[in-house]
Structures are given as C-alpha cells and as structure tokens.
C-alpha cells in the first residue's frame, strides 16, 4: 500500500459567544483537512478525532464517524468543527477577548487531529498537531493558512 497523506490546512472559521455571568467564552472552530489517497484502490475515512488545547488544557473535543470514501489517487477536503469552552481557571481570557479597545484578540490554540482510514480491513491512523491563531473577540472567517502560528516567542495581541 502507498501512503495516505493528511494535511492540516488551518482554521476556516471561528464563531464566538460569551456568558457574562460565567465569564466564559464559547468558540466554535471549523478546521480544514486535505486527505490524499495515493493508492490505486479506494480508502474509507472511518473517523476523525480532534481536540483543541489552550494553556496546556484541553478546551474542546470532537469526533466524526463514517466520513467519506476517497477514490484511487484522489484527494478530498474535509471540514470539521470543534466546540470549545474557555472558562474557570482560564477565565482571565474573558477580559482580553471582550476588550473593545483592541481590534484583534488573537489567542494561540493547539489543534490536534487524528484521522483513521481503513482499506481491505486494515486500519491506519495519522495524527497532526499545529498551533493556530484564533480571534476570540469576534466571528472570523479565515483564508486557508491565514491563522498559522509561526513565531513562538512573539505572539501578536
């Protein structure tokens, strides 16, 4: 068998809402993956499991099952959404994300995704990890790759 390539493309959109009484931020983050089948036979994308971390804490998880079949030498783009909650010990972010005096409220999130594919009864798992910027201050749609977090020591605010 040839490889199945999984490429995490980035955040497609982030929709934000707040609970004032709980000082809580709700972020629905939609991510995009490209999955390429380099084989001469079809493979099934059985499931995608994803989690999002902020401040070394998992703030959201998602699992998609029986997603799609990718034909021979074909590629499919798949979007998946992870609902996340920033609350309690991370509620110091509430003030930052709701502060109106700054335009962009970028926070750095770690996106983790595992894709499970099957073919001829054989199962394969491929994982990716990527740091991404997400604006927690407003609903945002991103150009693919625009939310990439590159500079580890100098995050923007």
């Amino acid at each position: 068998p040839r490889s199945i390539d999984v490429k995490y493309i980035g955040v497609k959109s982030a929709y934000v809402s707040y609970d004032v009484q709980k000082r809580t931020i709700y972020l629905n983050i939609t991510n995009t993956l490209n999955i390429t089948n380099n084989n001469y036979y079809s493979v099934e994308v059985e499931n995608i499991t994803a989690q999002v971390q902020f401040s070394k804490t998992v703030i959201g998880k998602a699992r998609l099952n029986n997603i799609t079949i990718i034909g021979p030498l074909d590629m499919k783009q798949i979007d998946y959404t992870v609902p996340t909650v920033i609350a309690e010990e991370m509620s110091y972010m509430y003030d930052f994300c709701t502060l109106i005096s700054i335009k962009v409220h970028n926070i750095v999130l770690m996106m983790q995704v595992t894709v499970t594919t099957t073919y001829f009864g054989h199962s394969e798992q491929i994982s990716q990890e990527r740091y991404q910027y997400v604006d927690c201050g407003r609903n945002t749609t991103y150009q693919l790759g625009q939310s990439e977090y590159l500079n580890v020591l100098q995050p923007q605010q």
């Epitope: 004032v20 009484q21 709980k22 000082r23 401040s55 070394k56 804490t57 309690e88 010990e89 991370m90 509620s91 110091y92 972010m93 509430y94 003030d95 930052f96 750095v108 580890v152 020591l153 995050p155 605010q157």
Partner: antibody, heavy 118, light 107 residues
Framework: QVQLQQSGTELARPGASVKVSCKAS????????ITWVKQRGGQGLEWIGE????????YYNEKFKDKATLTADKSSSTAYMELRSLTSEDSAVYFC???????????WGQGTTVTVSS | DIQMTQSPASLSASVGETVTITCRAS??????LAWYQQKQGKTPQLLVY???MLAENVPSRFSGSGSGTQFSLKINSLQPEDFGSYYC?????????FGAGTKLELK
C-alpha cells in the same frame, strides 16, 4: 464595592487543623473564582489553589493537595480553606482573593495569620 | 512547573524617576503574566494582567510589556505611594507561580 473579609488569627497545635473563611460581597459570588495564596514571614507569595463556586470545581497546586481543602458556600457567599496536619512550616499569612482566572487575584482579603506552635 | 525569575531583587529610586522591573519565565507563557504591588503589612494589589492590561483603578504611570519569556513592568514618574514590593506571576497553566519579588525603596 467588592470586599473579601477573612476570619481572624488562628493559633494551632502541630497536627491539628484550621479552617479559614473568606466572605465575599459587592459582586455575584458565582461569577468569579476564589484563589488562595500563602505568604511566610513577609517573604514571597505562593499559590495554593482556587475554587469556582458556581461549579464547585477546584484547582490545586500539587504542593498543597494534601495540605489544603477548598470549599465554598454559595448561600452565604463564603469560601473556606481547611489546612490539616499542621506543622511549623504552615505558619504564615493566608490570603483569599477574587480570581480573574488561574490565580490572578484582583481583590484581596486582609489576610489571616496562622501560627502553629506547641 | 514554570519558574519565574525576577530582577533586580531590590532597587532604590527617587520620587519622579522612572524604573523598570523585569521578569523571566522558564518557558514560553505567551502574554499571560500579571504584576502585583504589595506594601509592607498590606495585601497585594493587582496592577497588570495578560502582560499589559491595566487592572481597575491602576494609574496610567504603570505599564506592562513583553511576551514569550521576557516581561517588564515600567513605572513612570515614581510617586511616594509606589514604594513597596512588586511580584510577577504567570497565569499560563497550573500552578500559576510568582516571582521572588522586587523591593522598591526610596533613595
């Protein structure tokens, strides 16, 4: 205005337990957490842990996990910290503070002095 | 655990001067740092959090800056009430540790 009123000085024997209270007023008690900090002899500050009264979720510094228990009573807007198996190392001033999250205290109680002596 | 290193340990200055206190984290804490002031025998007071956000009722002569592992607190035109101890504290992950403090004394 936001106020945190702590209980008075505690004098305890080694091996005993004490319970320090922190009564909050001037804000909705369940909106914020209450964080607890230790200060020995006017020296540095050490984070013990915090509690979120809305959910009763607690977050501890591993160092204090077997030493301190944090609780909160929503009906009286009061947070408590119980310190057990006291030793002379526990003699310190203990502060409670309203937490903006992860131990960041924006309003502080006046401090409770705990003295452990035989 | 993340360690916080503060410098200098003590500092003498006069009213009207500008002083800077620095804090270094043992690993990347992004912008998640707070600064406190504590006067002798009093409770700590939050000055800055999220690196540079001023807390309520804090005079604008105080300013926080930095990100990643290097941070500083700048006090412009020192006032008599500014003398005391200053502590940094990261609030990125658990436990949120404090620096050892900087004692700011009147020259």
């Amino acid at each position: 205005q936001v106020q945190l009123q702590q209980s008075g000085t505690e004098l305890a024997r080694p091996g005993a337990s004490v319970k320090v209270s922190c009564k909050a007023s001037g804000y909705i008690f369940t909106t914020y957490g209450i964080t607890w900090v230790k200060q020995r002899g006017g020296q540095g500050l050490e984070w013990i842990g915090e509690i979120y009264p809305r959910s009763d979720n607690t977050y501890y510094n591993e160092k204090f996990k077997d030493k301190a228990t944090l609780t909160a009573d929503k009906s009286s807007s009061t947070a408590y910290m119980e310190l057990r198996s006291l030793t002379s190392e526990d003699s310190a001033v203990y502060f409670c503070a309203r937490s903006k999250g992860s131990g960041t205290g924006d309003y502080w109680g006046q401090g409770t002095t705990v003295t452990v002596s035989s | 655990d993340i360690q916080m290193t503060q410098s200098p340990a003590s500092l003498s200055a006069s009213v009207g001067e500008t002083v800077t206190i620095t804090c270094r984290a043992s690993e990347n804490i992004y912008i998640y740092l707070a600064w406190y002031q504590q006067k002798q025998g009093k409770t700590p007071q939050l000055l800055v959090y999220n690196g540079k956000m001023l807390a309520e009722n804090v005079p604008s002569r105080f300013s926080g800056s930095g990100s990643g592992t290097q941070f500083s607190l700048k006090i412009n035109s020192l006032q008599p009430e500014d003398f005391g101890s200053y502590y940094c504290q990261h609030h990125y992950g658990s436990p949120p540790a404090f620096g050892a403090g900087t004692k700011l004394e009147l020259k």
